[in-house]
Amino acid sequence: RQQWELQGDRRCQSQLERANLRPCEQHLMQKIQRDEDSYGRDPYSPSQDPYSPSPYDRRGAGSSQHQERCCNELNEFENNQRCMCEALQQIMENQSDRLQGRQQEQQFKRELRNLPQQCGLRAPQRCDLEVESGGRDRY
C-alpha cells in the first residue's frame, strides 16, 4: 500500500512537472478581466497587467483557445483527484501575486473552482484552494 502511494505520488509530481498550466492561468485571468470590463473596472486598480487580453482576446476567441488547451492539460489529472487538486493549487499559487485586491482574488478562486466542471471533469473533493503565497511544502 505504502509503496503504491509513493509511486502514485511520484507519478503526480512528474505529471505536474510535465503539465503546462499556463493556458489555464491565462484563460482565468482573461475571464475575470472580461467580467471586470462588463461590470466596470475599479478606477484605483493599475490599468495594465501582463495578462491583459488583447482586443482579439476580448472577443473571446483567444480565451476559448486557452480554455481548450487548459482542459486538455487538466484532462491528464482526471483519474487522480489529489493530483487534480495539486494542479489547481499550483494555478492559484502562481497567480496569487498578480491578483489585485480581495475581490479579484475571490473572483479568480470562484472561476478556478468551476474550471474542472467547465472542462467536463470531476471537481476534486477535500481540496483546499485557500493558498497563501509562500505555498505548501511539496510532497
Partner: antibody
Amino acid sequence: QKQLVESGGGLDQPAGSLKLSCKDSGFTLSTFYMTWVHQAPGKGLEWIANIKQDGSEKDYLDSVRGRFTISSDNTQNMVDLEMNSLTAADMAIYFCARNGLQDSYSGDFFDHWGQGTLVTVSS
Amino acid sequence: QPALTQPSSVSGALGGSVTITCSGTGSNIGHNYVSWYQQLPGSVPKLLMFDNTKRPSGIPERFSGSKSGTTASLTISGLQPEDEADYYCATWDADLSAVLFGGGTKLTVL
C-alpha cells in the same frame, strides 16, 4: 432537536464481535457523510470510518480495515459499525458523528456528535 | 503516534490569549482543510472551526483559525475559565485515505 444516539456497546471477549448502531432524529442522514470516531480511556480522538450515506464511498482506518464494516440504512436513518476480531486495543468509547463534507472543495468536519457508547474487550 | 502534532498542553492567563498549533505534512494539512474541536472534561467533542477559518453558528468570535503551509493554528482570545478543555485538530490525509486527529492539547486557564 438534532440528535444522534449510539447503541450496541458492551463487554465482549477478545476475538469477539459487536455491532454498534447510530440512529438520528432531527435531520436526514441521507444527505450527509457519517463517521465513527473512538476514544480509548484517557486518550485522544481517533477516526475509525466514513460512509457516504448512499453507501457509494467508505473509508477505514488501516488498523480496522477488514475487521470493521460501516454500513447505512437510509430508510431507518441508521448507520452501523460491525466490529469483528476485537482486541484490547479496540476498547474505547465509540462516537458516531455527522460529517459536513461536501462533494468538492470542502473538508471533513464533525458538526453533530452522539453521546458515545462504551466498548469493553476483556476475557 | 498521531501524524498531526499538537503541544500536549498550553496555558494562558484569564482574559489573555493562547494559540494552539497543529503541524502535519503536504499530504494532510498542506492539501486539505482543517477542523478544530473542544472537548470539556467528561463531555462530547464540539466543533469549533471548520474549513480552516469558518466558525459554526454559536461559536464566539474569540475563537479563530488559520492555516499556513502545513501548520494550522487555533487562537483563543479573552480566555475564560470555561475554556479549560482538550482541543483537537483534524484533517484528511490524501496518502492514507483517512481522517487524522492531532494528539490533543490540554488548555489551562491561570
